[in-house]
Interface confidence: low
C-alpha cells in the first residue's frame, strides 16, 4: 500500500470553495487556504479528509497495490479500504504486503481457521489442541501463522 | 473505539521529576492535536499543555511554563509530559485529552481514565 | 476575577428543566467565541457534552443525548447549557470552556455542581 505523508504535494488543480472556517478549522472533506480565510474542498476520487483541521491540503487517497482489492473506495471523507486478495493475508509484522496463505496444515496437525485478508490458517496438533507455532520443515513448502490485523484504512 | 490510558503517575518529592505517557489507540493518533488537563483533589480542571497534530507547536499554561514539556511520538501513538522541579500545587489527577481537530482548540471529545501525581516531602 | 464564572452550585427537581450558566468576563466579547460544556460525574474523567457557537453553528458530543443543549446571551456576554427532562445520573458537575483559534491557551471555567432533587 503506498501511505502518503501529512504534507501531501502541491498541485495546481481548481478545487471548489465552500465555506468559511470555524475557529480557524475545516470540516471533514476539506483543508483550509494559504490565508486561512476559506475551506476549499478535497476533491473526490483523488484526496480526503477524516475530520475537522486546519490542513493546507487535504491527504491524498490510497491506491491499492496489485494482490489488493478496493473493499471501499475515497470518498472526500474517507480514505480508500484496502484488502488482500482471496487466498492471501496481511501479517501483523509487515503490513505492507500480502502474504500467501497455507495451503494445509503439516502432518498430524488438523485446520481450525480458514484463510482470512487478515489471517493465515490455524492448525492445531491432532492428540494436544495446541496451536502450531514453530518453523514448518521446508519440505512442507508453508509459512508460519501470526496473528493478522483485520483491514482498515490505509492511512 | 477510541481509548486513552495514561500512565507514570506516583509519589514524588518536591523539586523532583516525573514522566507522564499516554498510551492512545483506536483512531489515527498522527492527525489529532492533544492535550492534558489536571484536576487537584476537590477541585476544577485545570488545562496544563496542548500539542498538534504534528508535534510543531507545543503551548503551555503559565502555572507549569518552564518546568512541564509536551511531547508525542506519532509512532508510537504516544503523548508524553516531563514535569521538572515538581511544587505541591502540581498534585493532581493528570489527564490525556484528545481534541477533535488537527488543531488545539476547546473541543477535548475524548479522555483517559486519569493518573495521579503526589507531590509530597 | 477569573476569565469564565460559573455558580458554584445549583439543584433542580427530578424531570424538570434548568439553565447553567457561564459567564465571560467583559473585557472579552462572547460573539467571537464557541461555548464548550464538559459534565464530570463522581470518580469519572470529564466527557464532551456540546458545542455552542449560534443555532446554525454547533455540536453535540458522542452519545449525548438532545436534552442537553447550548445557548448564547451576546448582551449579558453569557453561554448557557440546557439540561432538559432532568434525570438521577445527570447530578454531576459542568464546566465550560470558551475560546478562538487565536488563543492557544485553555481555560475552563470553575464548575457548577448540579444536585437533582427527587
Known amino acids: 500500500i503506498t501511505r502518503q505523508s501529512l504534507d501531501p504535494q502541491r498541485r495546481a488543480a481548481p478545487q471548489q470553495k465552500r465555506s468559511s472556517p470555524t475557529e480557524g478549522l475545516c470540516p471533514p472533506g476539506h483543508h483550509i487556504s494559504e490565508d486561512s480565510r476559506e475551506c476549499i474542498s478535497c476533491k473526490y476520487g483523488q484526496d480526503y479528509s477524516t475530520h475537522w483541521n486546519d490542513f493546507l491540503f487535504c491527504l491524498r487517497c490510497t491506491k491499492c497495490d496489485s494482490g489488493e482489492v478496493e473493499v471501499n473506495s475515497c470518498t472526500t471523507t474517507r480514505n480508500t479500504v484496502c484488502q488482500c486478495e482471496e487466498g492471501t493475508f496481511r501479517e501483523e509484522d509487515s503490513p505492507e504486503i500480502c502474504r500467501k496463505c497455507r495451503t494445509g496444515c503439516p502432518r498430524g496437525m488438523v485446520k481450525v481457521k480458514d484463510c482470512t485478508p487478515w489471517s493465515d490458517i490455524e492448525c492445531v496438533h491432532k492428540e494436544s489442541g495446541t496451536k502450531h507455532t514453530g518453523e514448518v520443515p521446508a519440505v512442507e513448502k508453508t509459512v508460519t501463522t501470526s496473528p493478522g490485523t483485520p483491514a482498515s484504512p490505509c492511512s | 473505539e477510541v481509548q486513552l490510558v495514561e500512565s507514570g503517575g506516583g509519589l514524588v518529592k518536591p523539586g523532583g521529576s516525573l514522566r507522564l505517557s499516554c498510551a492512545a489507540s483506536g483512531f489515527t493518533f498522527s492527525t489529532y492535536g492533544m492535550h492534558w488537563v489536571r484536576q487537584a483533589p476537590g477541585k476544577g480542571l485545570e488545562w496544563v499543555a496542548g500539542?498538534?497534530?504534528?508535534?510543531?507547536?507545543?503551548y503551555y499554561a503559565d502555572s507549569v511554563k518552564g518546568r512541564f514539556t509536551i511531547s508525542r511520538d506519532n509512532a508510537k501513538n504516544s503523548l508524553y509530559l516531563q514535569m521538572n522541579s515538581l511544587r505541591a500545587e502540581d498534585t493532581a489527577v493528570y489527564y490525556c485529552?484528545?481534541?477533535?481537530?488537527?488543531?488545539?482548540?476547546?473541543?477535548?471529545?475524548?479522555w483517559g481514565q486519569g493518573t495521579l501525581v503526589t507531590v509530597s516531602s | 476575577q477569573p476569565v469564565l464564572h460559573q455558580p458554584p452550585a445549583m439543584s433542580s427537581a427530578l424531570g424538570t428543566t434548568i439553565r447553567l450558566t457561564c459567564t465571560l468576563r467583559n473585557d472579552h466579547d462572547i460573539g467571537v467565541y464557541s461555548v464548550y460544556w464538559y459534565q464530570q460525574r463522581p470518580g469519572h474523567p470529564p466527557r464532551f457534552l456540546l458545542r455552542y457557537f449560534s443555532q446554525s453553528d454547533k455540536s453535540q458530543g458522542p452519545q449525548v443525548p438532545p436534552r442537553f443543549s447550548g445557548s448564547k446571551d451576546v448582551a449579558r456576554n453569557r453561554g448557557y447549557l440546557s439540561i432538559s427532562e432532568l434525570q438521577p445520573e445527570d447530578e454531576a458537575m459542568y464546566y465550560c470552556a470558551m475560546g478562538a483559534r487565536s488563543s492557544v491557551t485553555h481555560v475552563f471555567g470553575s464548575g457548577t455542581q448540579l444536585t437533582v432533587l427527587s
Open positions: 485529552a484528545r481534541d477533535h481537530s488537527t488543531w488545539l482548540s476547546r473541543h477535548l471529545d475524548y
Open positions: 500539542i498538534n497534530y504534528s508535534g510543531n507547536n507545543k
